[in-house]
């Protein structure tokens, strides 16, 4: 099985024990590590952070001791914006220039492939996204013809039904991608006005329409029905939780909220907590399991957080094995307890290790 793990370059800026550099990663933990994100400037793939080249080197040095490790560079992301991607993909010359710039950039910096993180193609971009993928793959084939190892091509796709329908021609893009990471998280957010788990495995009994689509099982099944081969589908598992501020004394699933949860001490983003921050939060918190959805949530005071733990990730891995998927994807290594100092287990990357162990179990 593949274990595809994202690393985010901006995690270096978190203060104190939250700061994560690629040299802190475990070279034997994942089969693939994806560095997020690269930029596109003047239609050419480019660095984003001032020290990306140094960090690329740090990451790719991990392969010296584990030659089986593959590294990919992810281009795009939330801050890049869909519009910029759209302009490049819809223009034949811009698209060609971008595509041609990719192999030398990846080769120069020691990456094994490219991950496309266009978040997200609009309805009018659907065909252009397919063309971009098809032409990128053709370039990778051509570039590898004289005896080079062919560069890998993957894409991170939304798990939301509405986005899937408008953004992706699943059957066509699947032909050209080496694997597809389906982002089976962020199904529920503060915009709903109630508490809810952002990455349930199954539909909960409490869910009302349209929430029958807002779970991992539906998204995976839908992708498969649309023509994604199970052998290319990698299922996303988050090492972060989504938090809410409760608006009343109700604390269950579906309780009213006044907004996102308070920012974490390190991640400093309202409504999001890294797993290592959740381990801190759990001291003195009440933990519940949403039985049907097979995921936990915790409450403390007026704070509510839905997250994944070692038990839920094992259930998710069993599910992806039952579905005969290609493996699991983790967002993100730097949100797991990468130092092993927060979650009281004397183990670095406890969630990702639990996924790895479950993938290896017979």
């Amino acid at each position: 099985y593949k274990l595809v793990c994202y690393y985010t370059s901006w995690s270096q800026y978190r203060e104190g024990d939250g700061s994560c550099f690629p040299d802190a990663l475990d070279r034997f933990l994942c089969t693939h590590i994806i560095y997020s994100f690269a930029n596109i400037s003047n239609d050419h793939i480019d660095t984003w952070e001032w020290n990306d080249v140094t960090l690329y080197g740090m990451l790719n040095t991990l392969k010296n001791r584990n030659p089986n490790l593959k590294t990919l560079l992810s281009v795009g992301g939330w801050n890049f914006g869909s519009q910029r991607f759209s302009k490049i993909a819809s223009n034949t010359q811009s698209r060609r220039t971008f595509i041609k710039s990719v192999p030398p950039f990846l080769r120069t910096h020691g990456f094994d492939g490219l991950d496309l993180a266009w978040l997200y193609p609009g309805r009018r971009d659907k065909q252009h996204f397919t063309t971009l993928i098809k032409e990128m793959k053709a370039e990778f084939i051509k570039e590898a013809q004289p005896g080079k190892k062919q560069l890998l091509l993957s894409a991170a796709l939304s798990a939301g039904k509405v986005t899937i329908d408008s953004s992706y021609d699943i059957a066509k893009i699947s032909q050209h991608l080496d694997f597809i990471s389906i982002m089976t998280y962020d199904f529920h957010g503060a915009w709903r006005g109630t508490t809810g788990h952002h990455s349930p495995l199954f539909r909960g009994q409490e869910d009302a329409s349209p929430d029958r689509f807002s779970n991992t099982d539906y998204a995976v099944g839908y992708m498969l029905r649309l023509g994604a081969p199970a052998s290319k589908l990698v299922m996303g598992i988050p090492t972060f939780g989504r938090s809410f501020t409760l608006a009343s004394s109700e604390t269950g699933v579906g309780a009213p909220i006044s907004g996102p949860g308070i920012p974490g001490r390190f991640t400093k983003e309202a409504g999001t907590l890294a797993y290592y921050e959740i381990c801190d939060f759990l001291r003195g918190a009440t933990v519940h399991r949403i039985l049907g959805q097979q995921v936990p949530y915790a409450t403390k005071g007026n704070q509510w957080v839905g997250y994944d733990d070692q038990e839920s990730v094992k259930s998710k891995v069993q599910y992806l094995k039952d579905r005969q998927l290609a493996g699991a994807m983790v967002w993100a290594l730097d949100l797991d307890d990468f130092q092993g100092s927060f979650c009281g287990q004397d183990l670095r990357f406890p969630l990702t290790n639990a996924i790895k162990d479950a993938l290896a179990a017979t």
Partner: antibody, heavy 116, light 111 residues
Amino acid sequence: EVQLVQSGAEVKKPGATVKISCKVSGYTFTDYYMHWVQQAPGKGLEWMGLVDPEDGETIYAEKFQGRVTITADTSTDTAYMELSSLRSEDTAVYYCATIGRPPDYWGQGTTVTVSS
Amino acid sequence: QSVLTQPPSVSAAPGQKVTISCSGSSSNIGNNYVSWYQQLPGTAPKLLIYDNNKRPSGIPDRFSGSKSGTSATLGITGLQTGDEADYYCGTWDSSLSVWVFGGGTKLTVLG
């Protein structure tokens, strides 16, 4: 059926320039790089360079840098190799080819003789 | 002087096995795939092995390839007189950004 048909034999004087063509049929010309290979009489294969027919980008071997120009014309599915400032050591058979992995296609070769 | 080093010649009797070595460096053989070509007298080279050990369709399984570190080997079993030819290894060199051939090995089938 795939064919790479090269132009005929050439006899050139030292200092002259030769331009050899390689007409492709049976596959999509822009799908693969086109390489050129030199083989002097009784000697081994020497890689000269390549062109990406899609956009004309080239890579040349250091030995031929400055003397060789490889081009591609997508309107006629033809690749060209031009070698200038010819000297006697350039007497050789020149091949166009899509080297490395299948599909691995080679032209029949063009003999160039450089003699005063 | 070729970037890839091959023995100039090898010989063996019909029915025997022969191996041809190709030695390079980490920037070529070490990090890329090796191809092997057979060139019969007066003809264009023909691909025998690609990606270190794969045979194109139509190439008999008497021909095999392997790679270890910065060296590659072509093996031919059940030698036939028709195998008498020049054999070249080739690969991409990542640091020079060029394709490189070995100097070639002349195979003589004795008898």
